[in-house]
C-alpha cells in the first residue's frame, strides 16, 4: 500500500525472533488512543511480520499504525529503527493525518481484503478466475505464473497475498472486484462477520 505500510514492514522484518515476540507483548499493553481497539492476543502472538503489518494497518490505518509502531520500538530501546519510521512519517505527511481525531462512524479498519486475509486464503476456491481478472493490470506475468504454480487453492491464495503488502488501494479494489464477481456469497458472508 503506502510508504508508511512499507516502512512498518521493513522495521518489523528487521527484528529478531525474540524482538518480534517482545514487540507483540508490548503491543498488548501499550496505551492506545481513544476510539481504537486492541488486536486480540491469540491472533497477535501467531503473526509473522507480514501478518502483523497487515493487522496494524487494518486496525489503526497507516498514520496511527506508523506512530504506534514507533512508540513500541522506542519502548524496546530500538531508537534507530524508530527514527527511520519518524523520517518516513515526516516525508509522507502522515504527521497531519495522525493528528486528526478519529471521527465516530469513520472506519478504523483496513481494506476488505486485508481484514479478511485468512478467511479468503481458506475459502476462495476459484483462484484461477481471480488471477485472470488481475493478470496484467495488477499481477505481472511472473507473479501470475508463480501463483498458478502452487498446487492447492489455499497455497495459491497464500502466494497471492504475499504480493498484497506492496499493492495500492486500486490494486486491492481490483482483487475485491474479482472476488465480488466470482465469489459473491463469500464476500457477503465475510461482510456480515
Amino acid at each position: 500500500m503506502g510508504r508508511a505500510r512499507d516502512a512498518i514492514l521493513d522495521a518489523l522484518e528487521n527484528l529478531s525472533g525474540d524482538e518480534l515476540k517482545k514487540f507483540k507483548m508490548k503491543l498488548l499493553t501499550v496505551q492506545l488512543r481513544e476510539g481504537y481497539g486492541r488486536i486480540p492476543r491469540g491472533a497477535l502472538l501467531q503473526m509473522d511480520a507480514i501478518d502483523l503489518t497487515d493487522k496494524l494497518v487494518s486496525y489503526y490505518l497507516e498514520s496511527y499504525g506508523l506512530e504506534l509502531t514507533m512508540t513500541v520500538l522506542r519502548d524496546m530501546g530500538l531508537q534507530e529503527l524508530a527514527e527511520q519510521l519518524q523520517t518516513t512519517k515526516e516525508e509522507s505527511g502522515a504527521v497531519a493525518a495522525a493528528a486528526s481525531v478519529p471521527a465516530q462512524s469513520t472506519a478504523r479498519t483496513g481494506h476488505f481484503v486485508d481484514q479478511h486475509r485468512q478467511a479468503l486464503i481458506a475459502r476462495v476456491t476459484e483462484v484461477d478466475g481471480v488471477l485472470d481478472a488481475l493478470h496484467g493490470s495488477v499481477l505481472t506475468e511472473g507473479q501470475y505464473q508463480a501463483v498458478r504454480a502452487e498446487t492447492t487453492s489455499q497455497d495459491k491464495m497464500r502466494k497471492l497475498f504475499s504480493f498484497v503488502p506492496s499493492w495500492n488501494l486500486t490494486c486491492k479494489d481490483s482483487l475485491l472486484q474479482a472476488l465480488k464477481e466470482i465469489h459473491p456469497y463469500l464476500v457477503m458472508d465475510l461482510e456480515q462477520s
Partner: antibody, heavy 122, light 107 residues
C-alpha cells in the same frame, strides 16, 4: 464531525482548465478515498473516479480519462479535481464525496461536499 | 458498464401514501446497491446501503429490498419532507453507475 468543503462556483471559457478543491475535516485525509461525481441540470449522477491520498493511487471512469485529474495535498487536507479542455458539456455541478466505511465490500457515500457549480461559456 | 434503469421517472402521490420506486441492473449486482435522496438545491443523502440496510439517522419509513438485478425502494406514510429525486447506485463494479432518478412530488 466529518465535513467536505468545496471551492466556490467557477465561470470559465471553453478550452480552459479549472481546478476544484475539496477540503476535509473531522478525519485524516489519508484514511479514506475521495470520489468525485458530476451532475448536469435535470440529469442524473455520473461517477468520475476516486483518488486515495493514503497511497496516491487513483481509479477513473473511462469516460473521464483525459478530462479529469485527481490529486490531493495531505498537508492542507485537501483533494483536488482538475478538468481540462473545457466545453459546454462540462458545465455541471461537481461533488466530492467520501465512502461511509473504508472496510466495506463496496462504497456507499455517506459524506458529500456541498457541490461546485462549473459554467463553461464564452 | 452496468446500466441502472430506474422507474418511474416521476411520481406524484398523496401524503400518507406508500410508494415504491424500482431499479433494474443490466447484470447481477448481488446486494451492492445504494439509494440516495436529493432534495431541490441540496446534495444527495444516503438512505439505504447494501440493498436493504437503513443508513444511520434515516427514517424507518424508508425501506429497501431486492438482490441480483431487481431492487425496490419503498416509502411508507409519505411526508412533505420526502419530496425530491431518488437515485439508485450500483457498487458491484467500476465504473459505479446511477439510475436516472425518480422525481417525487406531493399531490
Amino acid at each position: 464531525q466529518v465535513q467536505l468543503q468545496q471551492s466556490d462556483a467557477e465561470l470559465v471559457k471553453p478550452g480552459a482548465s479549472v481546478k476544484i478543491s475539496c477540503k476535509v475535516s473531522g478525519y485524516a485525509l489519508t484514511d479514506h478515498s475521495i470520489h468525485w461525481m458530476k451532475q448536469r441540470p435535470e440529469q442524473g449522477l455520473a461517477w468520475i473516479g476516486y483518488m486515495y491520498p493514503g497511497d496516491g493511487s487513483a481509479n477513473y471512469n473511462d469516460k473521464f480519462k483525459g478530462k479529469a485529474t485527481l490529486t490531493a495535498d495531505i498537508s492542507s487536507s485537501t483533494a483536488y479535481m482538475q478538468l481540462n479542455s473545457l466545453t459546454s458539456e462540462d458545465s455541471a455541478v461537481y461533488f466530492c464525496t467520501r465512502p461511509y466505511y473504508f472496510g466495506s465490500s463496496y462504497d456507499y457515500f455517506g459524506y458529500w461536499g456541498q457541490g461546485t457549480t462549473l459554467t463553461v461559456s464564452s | 458498464d452496468i446500466q441502472m434503469n430506474q422507474s418511474p421517472s416521476s411520481l406524484s402521490a398523496s401524503l400518507g401514501d406508500t410508494i415504491t420506486i424500482t431499479c433494474h441492473a443490466s447484470q447481477n449486482i448481488n446486494v451492492w446497491l445504494s439509494w440516495y435522496q436529493q432534495k431541490p438545491g441540496n446534495v444527495p443523502k444516503l438512505l439505504i446501503y447494501k440493498a436493504s440496510k437503513l443508513h444511520t439517522g434515516v427514517s424507518s419509513n424508508f425501506s429497501g429490498s431486492g438482490s441480483g438485478t431487481g431492487f425496490t425502494l419503498t416509502i411508507s406514510s409519505l411526508q412533505p419532507e420526502d419530496i425530491g429525486t431518488y437515485y439508485c447506485q450500483q457498487g458491484q463494479s467500476y465504473p459505479y453507475t446511477f439510475g436516472g432518478g425518480t422525481k417525487l412530488e406531493i399531490k
